[in-house]
């Protein structure tokens, strides 16, 4: 049978040939009658055999990391017979390891993100090096990790390559660190090979900074003419944190006057001071408010960094604006009796300059020929007024500052012209009446009514009478209906168209004013030739035809 030990050949041997071992048959008695042969991958090129002795030699340098074992076949032949002495057999040559490979970090580059202010012991990242040497062969591939750069903030676990925080870090002081890790094989013993890697460790932000005002005192100004909602200025705080952790909200901490408000511009992170209530320079021209600023988002565990909000004081100076005159009332209503003489007193309007300088005021009336106003605001008439022409006057009174004629205010003034009884009642229309020749006594000829242009406080009441002459010699009589109407009746039987074709009756109408006024109104009565029915229709028709130029037969 075959006789051999396990074959090993060290890698990286520089000699021309290196004795690996000997193959032999136990039938070989050393008389050189056997011939040994080597077959298989590497036979003749990497390994050769002494055909006589069976000694195997490596004739080239081997690299275990390239090939760690060779499987060869051996034959032994009896030279005399040419026959195989032993059956062909497979054997293995193992390449033994030497420490010829340094550790390598294959997952480079390394980058890790860890929250700032993380406590000691927080895991950052694990780095792993690979060593191509044989892990089963001594310590050639047993690695030890150490920190070349990164103290005192980081540490590395020697056997695992786990990087941990060893000291709290503040992103606001330094936001990234380069850590250099070394991996050594041979567990760091002499002759060990090493490799290094760099790890970029970035600190993510936590909200460990509160916003702080850039200024402890601000000065703003606002015009007294500014409407509510006006932005009067901005205030600014800074926060060393970034992103969401730097978002802030401004608010009023102190404003006794409740005149101002602060809104936050979330794009610029500024506080905008706005006017909540209109200001009046003459009432208050200096304000002081205190504003505070806080982060929008604060985690409970970070509250210790946000105990007292930063505050600032804002002085606000109100700027005076020359304001137009201010009337005592928004409008005035005055009364004056009609027919009062020119220059009569109507009323007084009053405006003042609301500013501190108290400019004198000049008054004027826009487009009026009926009224006048003096520098004291006294309104008088320039003509006598007639209520029956105009009962109300709508005036526009303008007040102008003497020191600044551009400062003008106008208000409406309503003047009511009060009635006096200066008009007597009169017929409400023109009456044309007709009576038949054959009319009997007591026949109703006409119903009349009256109007009075005067205004009556109570209801108008009119009194109807015939004139004295007509009462004494009248063919007609009048009855007052007591309802502002009266009826005219015949006072005799029969009329003669030929003798008296027309009657003119004077009717007196009196009103109930104080003093009472009376007018004389003439009623025209035509005598008609009527048919038997006593209708005046034909008479009226005849009248119409005559008035149009036709003659009736």
């Amino acid at each position: 049978g075959w006789v051999w030990n396990q074959f090993f050949v060290p890698e990286e041997m520089n000699t021309t040939s290196h004795h690996v071992g000997r193959l032999r048959s136990d039938l070989d008695n050393g008389n050189n009658s056997f011939q040994y042969k080597l077959l298989g991958a590497g036979a003749g090129s990497t390994f050769i055999i002494d055909e006589r002795t069976g000694d195997i030699y490596a004739i080239e340098k081997l690299d275990r990391e390239e090939r760690s074992l060779y499987i060869l076949r051996a034959q032994v032949i009896d030279i005399t017979t040419g026959r195989a002495v032993e059956p062909e057999s497979e054997f293995v040559i193992k390449v033994s390891d030497i420490n010829d490979n340094e550790p390598k970090f294959l997952d480079e580059p390394y980058e890790a993100i860890v929250p700032e202010m993380s406590p000691e012991g927080t895991l950052v990242i694990q780095v792993t090096a690979s060593d191509a040497d044989d892990p089963s062969s001594g310590n050639n591939a047993r690695l030890l990790y150490s920190l070349l750069q990164g103290q005192p903030y980081f540490s590395v676990e020697p056997t695992t390559g786990v990087i941990r925080i060893s000291s709290k870090m503040d992103r606001e002081l330094q936001d990234e660190y380069w850590v250099i890790i070394q991996a050594k094989d041979m567990i760091g013993q002499p002759g060990a090979l090493s490799g290094t890697t760099s790890v970029l460790i970035k600190l993510s932000d936590v909200n460990d900074n509160k916003p702080i005002f850039k200024e402890s005192l601000y000065r703003l100004t606002v015009s007294e003419s500014a409407p509510t909602g006006t932005s009067i200025g901005t205030i600014m705080a800074y926060d060393n944190d970034i992103g969401e952790n730097a978002e802030m909200d401004y608010s009023i901490e102190e404003d006794d006057s409740q005149t101002f408000d602060i809104i936050t511009n979330h794009e610029t992170q500024e506080g905008i001071v706005i006017l909540k209530k209109k200001v009046n320079f003459e009432h208050q021209n200096h304000y002081g408010i205190r504003a505070k600023v806080k982060n929008h988002h604060v985690d409970k565990q970070l509250m210790k960094y946000h105990t007292e909000a930063s505050t600032t004081f804002i002085k606000i100076q109100v700027e005076d604006v020359d304001e137009p005159p201010l009337f005592l009332l928004p409008y005035y209503i005055f009364e004056i009796f009609e027919e009062t003489p020119q220059g009569s007193f109507v009323g007084v309007v009053s405006a003042t300059d609301p500013d501190n300088r108290k400019s004198p005021i000049r008054y004027s009336i826009t487009r009026s020929k009926v009224f006048n106003i003096d520098d004291n605001g006294t309104i008088t008439t320039t003509n006598s007024l007639d209520r029956e022409i105009s009962a109300w006057y709508n005036l526009s009174i303008t007040a102008t500052e003497k020191y600044n004629i551009e400062q003008i205010s106008s208000i409406p003034v309503y003047v009511q012209v009060l009635n006096i009884n200066d008009h007597a009642p009169e017929f409400s229309q023109y009456y044309e009446s007709y009576v038949c020749e054959n009319a009997g006594s007591g026949q109703v000829i006409q119903t009349i009514s009256a109007v009075d242009r005067d205004e009556s406080i109570e209801e108008h009441h009119f009194y109807f009478n015939l004139s004295v002459e007509d009462t004494n010699s009248s063919s007609f009589t009048i009855i007052d209906n007591q309802d502002n109407t009266a009826v005219i009746l015949t006072n005799r039987t029969g009329f003669n168209l030929q003798e008296e074709p027309i009657f003119y009756i004077s009717i007196l109408i009196a009103d109930n004013g104080i003093p009472s006024l009376t007018s004389t109104n003439t009623l025209t009565i035509h005598v008609c030739d009527c048919d038997d029915s006593g209708s005046t229709q034909t008479c009226q028709y005849q009248e119409l035809m005559l008035s149009m130029g036709f003659k009736t037969e």
């Epitope: 005192l217 000065r219 006794d256 006057s257 208050q284 021209n285 200096h286 002081g288 205190r290 002085k315």
Partner: antibody, heavy 120, light 107 residues
């Protein structure tokens, strides 16, 4: 600590212009938010505010003195000045310069005052 | 303008006693706009209280201020010998006006 010091003639003739200067030390006159005032005190009487100025040159005066008062500022010299024209004996007083406070318009820092007498 | 009236004109008290000085405004002012000053002869006024109850830097806690609207008070809880002098109130809301002063003298 801010300190203020008034300087100027102690005697002014009637109808002339009274001129005083206040020099600020221990702080900048250009400090944001602070107003620099002149206040006077007639002999044995109360205090009367004359006017103030901001470092930008914006001034505001007591309405009763407005027509005669001018306050100006020189930031390069850290000084501000008062001019009161057409003086009469009624303007005889101790004149103080002052700075307002960090939390309001009260007067936190005062100069020691200078007596100005108006007399011919 | 806002007129400030101080009463009494003179307050005669003994050291160790409590002093109550009054300042009345002619119209309402916000409490944040009133200050008190102390003035010793030949010296400039010194800020005591502002707004109306905050003590200025270095002012002893025996001085306190209170009030709102039109009525304000300066209280000196226990008079020390150096407290016998003149006190002024000042409003700084509508322009700046001072009260006529109250003199605290030794009884």
């Amino acid at each position: 600590q801010v300190q203020l010091q008034e300087s100027g003639p102690g005697l002014v003739k009637p109808s002339q212009t009274l001129s005083l200067t206040c020099t600020v030390s221990g702080g900048s006159i250009s400090s944001s938010g602070y107003y620099w005032s002149w206040i006077r005190q007639h002999p044995g009487k109360g205090l009367e505010w004359i006017g103030y100025i901001y470092y930008t040159g914006s001034a505001y005066y007591n309405p009763s003195l407005k027509s005669r008062v001018t306050i100006s500022v020189d930031t390069s010299k850290n000084q501000f000045s008062l001019k009161l024209s057409s003086v009469t004996a009624a303007d005889t007083a101790v004149y103080y310069c002052a700075r307002d406070g960090s939390s309001g318009w009260y007067f936190q820092y005062w100069g020691q005052g200078t007596l100005v007498t108006v007399s011919s | 303008e806002i007129v400030l009236t101080q009463s009494p004109g003179t307050l005669s008290l003994s050291p160790g006693e409590r002093a109550t000085l009054s300042c009345r405004a002619s119209r309402n002012i916000s409490s944040s706009y009133l200050a008190w000053y102390q003035q010793k002869p030949g010296q400039a006024p010194r800020l005591l209280i502002y707004g109306p109850s905050s003590r200025a830097t270095g002012i002893p806690d025996r001085f306190s201020g209170s009030g709102s609207g039109t009525d304000f008070t300066l209280t000196i809880s226990r008079l020390e010998p150096e407290d016998f002098t003149v006190y002024y109130c000042q409003q700084y809301g509508s322009s700046f006006t001072f009260g006529p002063g109250t003199k605290v003298d030794i009884k």
